[in-house]
């Protein structure tokens, strides 16, 4: 997990999340997302 401090004085926590593609479809492999402040954005 990485933390980034911004000029506004608060911290935003970034965390990489990995899911298996076959859990949401028929493809194989991994899907990588980024969670920022509790929300998956990518």
């Amino acid at each position: 997990d990485a933390e980034f401090r911004h000029d506004s004085g608060y911290e935003v926590h970034h965390q990489k999340l990995v899911f298996f593609a076959e859990d949401v479809g028929s493809n194989k492999g991994a899907i990588i997302g980024l969670m920022v402040g509790g929300v998956v954005i990518a």
Partner: nanobody, 124 residues
Amino acid sequence: EVQLLESGGGLVQPGGSLRLSCAASGRTFNNYNMGWFRQAPGKGREFVAAVSRSGVSTYYADSVKGRFTISRDNAKNAVYLQMNSLRPEDTAIYYCAAAYRGTAINVRRSYDSWGQGTLVTVSS
């Protein structure tokens, strides 16, 4: 939930190999993505590798990629971690864990069933 029991740990020299096994009980084994985590002395529990429900897909931590291989045998309700080119920094207790489908497989909180762990020591 499933019950998990690890085996195969031990003392190995740097550069050596070990194969860890995890036996699972419960008829719902193939509903779970399976992972291995490890915890070195004085450190937190960290993700090592995961394998999908079918065994087709795998994912590895950067620190073990190319050295460790995770696999599973759904007919035997078992998961394996083949560890090659072992290093002293691989010394840890290794835990097998089960995560229900659709959850993030690289984070500890996704896993709701854990084994008791097996100790791997890499030392000359």
